[in-house]
């Protein structure tokens, strides 16, 4: 009878032991991840984390759709609303190159760096060629008129265009559109100023930054935080806290990201910081993921998001700061009339593109959205998307603007652009994080359900033989 | 050397003409658009007349409108002034200067126009 | 038209003297103002455009401010060169027009 008893008590033992032990994993293998994450996901030279800020190994597109203007006569001697179409995809490939002039700062753990542009186009993932026309705003001619409305300089910008056979639109190629191209209004002025003129002009051979960002040492819930952009703290565009550069670049966060929080990000490409919500939990080749979009709140006039009321800058367009969807960011464009919109004016008021017909805004093409691995902070995929419009106003002294009766803010294109973690990449983390985490959590379920269920088992054995013996 | 020179001054009996010239050196004035402004014996300064670049347009004073006229012959990088039915208040020295930004960045040494009987 | 109103019409001061002249728009100019300095029987100089700007070769002692309808030319130390007659113009509408001009004196 004791050897049977023996047996029972031992097998309940080594259960309660198995069940405690399975317990105990449960902290100290979530100590044992934390520990490994907060080590590789530092900003120094060894970590995973590292090499893969240095130099992406995700293949980064940058999408564009070009708004061909179908009526630029009308419209110029009409103000008739401006029909466009778009076209598009004209694919590149950017962000290619490695970060440059990488600098750490032992004394504030910091590091800082460039990150260089450049953008090779990919015929295979595109439409047409660089070299297809469009008709588009003439982006000389607006951005003048805005930058100069003393009337006296417009009568002399106005004998330039006219010299130069300018007019309110103008055809030119993908590339000169894009990358620039001389201006034959422009090349008149008398004075040294740039002639050349492109929607990103200067982009290839250019370099963003100097960032400098946390690099986790100290604290590694501020990794990957900007501490400062081009040596400042803020961005000199807007008003109060609007002004402040929040957050990381959007690639990284610090890891262990929850649900509830609110993702605070600066973008350079809109001149400001923004940030983006949960959404939904996605699963990306084999890797759990939460997918943060940026919401329609972010997009909203002061009227409707009290937060957004540095965000207006001027009152007249904006009729009154009641407008919403779009971004005034002149000022960081050197005064031209630069306004920044999701594409197809998605979350922006009907007053916006009431003067534009040929616009399908949707959300599944036209929001942005960031995937990110909880645990390591990473963005695994995104996709940014953005609308890049121009304004042009009537003007009584400039002859191709003279018969306009109102304000457009002109689509001129948008883009997407998009990264996803490659599927080697994707393997490779799956066995590196996932795999290892997921294989730690069945081992300590493996262990507690095993051990409760032999102790159960064997104390309940041990209990009926007991009382049968009693018996 | 970026030069403006003055000619044709005088004097002109009320209700007379005279063409001033204003010869131009290193630069186009074709470029810039050339104006006309007069100071009166003791007086301050008067803008009169602008030719905009490439001759788009031609700007006056109220004081002189219809009986001065600008012009520019940009084969000999000269401009001009026509002035007709002259009054003595016309008297000045009249300066052309150049600009394009609106103000006058580079000036003649003048030339005196004298109405009187 | 817009009217510039400059001043004092003219001012005495010593050499080494902060000298300050105003000069008012008649309506809102921006900052499209120049300043120049005219010597007896010589043609105007430029000084500043655009209300701030200091034109190329002109001494540092010179300065503007102001936008708007309200502007000012300093000479933070007055130079024996200086004693002149000064304007102020208007560059942000056709017709360009002046003011009647300050006269500074020796004291």
């Known amino acids: 009878g004791c050897d049977r008893n023996c047996g029972l008590i031992t097998g309940a033992v080594i259960g309660a032991v198995l069940a405690v032990f399975g317990g105990i994993l449960m902290p100290v293998g979530d100590m044992l991840i934390q520990k490994t994450i907060k080590k590789e996901v530092v900003l120094e030279e060894g970590t995973i984390a590292f090499k893969n800020w240095v130099k992406t190994g995700t293949e980064i597109y940058r999408q564009f759709w070009i708004f061909d203007v179908q009526n630029p006569q009308e419209v110029m001697m009409n103000s008739s609303n401006i029909q466009v179409k778009q076209r598009g995809p004209y694919t590149y490939r950017v962000r290619f190159l490695a970060k440059e002039n990488i600098t750490q700062d032992p004394k504030d753990n910091t590091v800082s760096f460039l990150q260089p542009n450049g953008a090779i186009f990919e015929p295979s993932l595109s439409v047409g060629t660089e070299a297809d026309n469009f008709t588009v705003l003439n982006l000389a001619v607006a951005a003048a008129s805005h930058i100069y409305p003393n009337p006296f300089v417009q009568v002399v910008l106005n004998s330039l265009i006219n010299k130069s056979k300018s007019s309110m639109f103008q055809v030119r190629t993908l590339r000169e559109l894009l990358w620039g191209y001389t201006d034959p209004f422009l090349s008149l002025v008398p004075y040294p100023v740039s002639t050349r003129v492109g929607m990103f002009y200067p982009y290839n051979n250019t370099a963003d930054g100097v960032y400098k960002v946390f690099n986790g040492k100290d604290s590694i819930s501020k990794v990957a935080i900007i501490d400062t952009y081009k040596g400042k703290r803020n961005l000199s565009y807007w008003e109060s806290y609007c002004d402040m550069i929040n957050g990381t670049d959007a690639a990284s966060f610090p890891p262990f990201v929850e649900k509830s929080q609110v993702l605070q990000f600066f973008s350079s490409d809109i001149c400001r910081s923004i940030y983006a919500v949960f959404e939904s939990d996605v699963n990306l080749k084999g890797i759990p993921v939460y997918r943060f979009v940026l919401p329609s709140k972010a997009f909203a006039s002061p009227v409707q998001n009290p937060d957004n009321h540095c965000f207006c800058t001027e009152k007249i367009i904006s009729k009154n700061c009641t407008s919403y969807g779009v971004l005034d960011i002149s000022k960081c464009k050197e005064g031209k009339p630069v306004y920044i919109s999701l594409p197809h004016f998605l979350y922006a008021s009907p007053d916006v593109s009431e003067t534009i017909d040929g616009l399908n805004p949707n959300e599944e093409e036209h929001r942005t959205y960031l995937d990110i691995e909880p645990i390591t902070g990473f963005t695994l995929q995104f996709a940014k998307r953005l609308q890049v419009n121009l304004l042009v106003k009537p003007s009584n002294k400039i002859q191709v603007l003279k018969r306009l009766k109102r304000n457009y803010i002109v689509p001129i294109l948008w883009l997407n652009e998009t990264g996803t973690i490659g599927d080697e990449k994707a393997k490779m983390f799956r066995s590196q994080v996932t795999g290892k985490i997921n294989l730690l959590g069945l081992i300590e379920m493996i262990l507690l359900s095993v051990g409760v269920v032999m102790f159960v088992a064997f104390m309940i054995s041990y209990c009926a033989c007991r009382s049968k013996t009693i018996k | 050397e970026v030069q403006l020179v003055e000619s044709g001054g005088g004097l002109v009996q009320p209700g007379g003409s005279l063409r001033l010239s204003c010869a131009a050196s290193g630069f186009t004035i074709s470029s810039f658009g050339i104006h006309w402004v007069r100071q009166a014996p003791g007086k301050g300064l008067e803008w009169v007349a602008w030719?905009?670049?490439?001759?788009?347009?031609?700007y006056y004073a109220d004081s002189v409108k219809g009986r001065f006229t600008i012009s520019a012959d940009t084969s000999k990088n000269t401009a001009y002034l026509q002035m007709n039915s002259l009054r003595a208040e016309d008297t000045a020295v009249y300066y052309c200067a150049r600009s394009f930004f609106g103000y006058f960045d580079y000036w003649g040494q003048g030339t005196l126009v004298t109405v009187s009987s | 038209d817009i009217q510039m109103t400059q001043s004092p019409s003219s001012l005495s001061a010593s050499v080494g003297d902060r000298v300050t002249i105003t000069c008012r728009a008649s309506?809102?100019?921006?900052?499209?103002v120049a300043w120049y300095q005219q010597k007896p029987g010589k043609a105007p100089k430029l000084l500043i455009s655009?209300?701030?700007s200091l034109y190329s070769g002109v001494p540092s002692r010179f300065s503007g401010s102001g936008s708007g309808t309200d502007f000012t030319l300093t000479i933070s130390s007055l130079q024996p060169e200086d004693f002149a007659t000064y304007y102020c113009?208007?560059?942000?509408?056709?017709?360009?027009?002046f003011g009647q001009g300050t006269k500074v004196e020796i004291k």
């Open positions: 030719i905009a670049p490439y001759g788009g347009e031609e």
């Open positions: 113009q208007q560059h942000s509408n056709a017709p360009l027009t």
């Open positions: 655009y209300a701030t």
């Open positions: 309506q809102d100019v921006s900052n499209w």
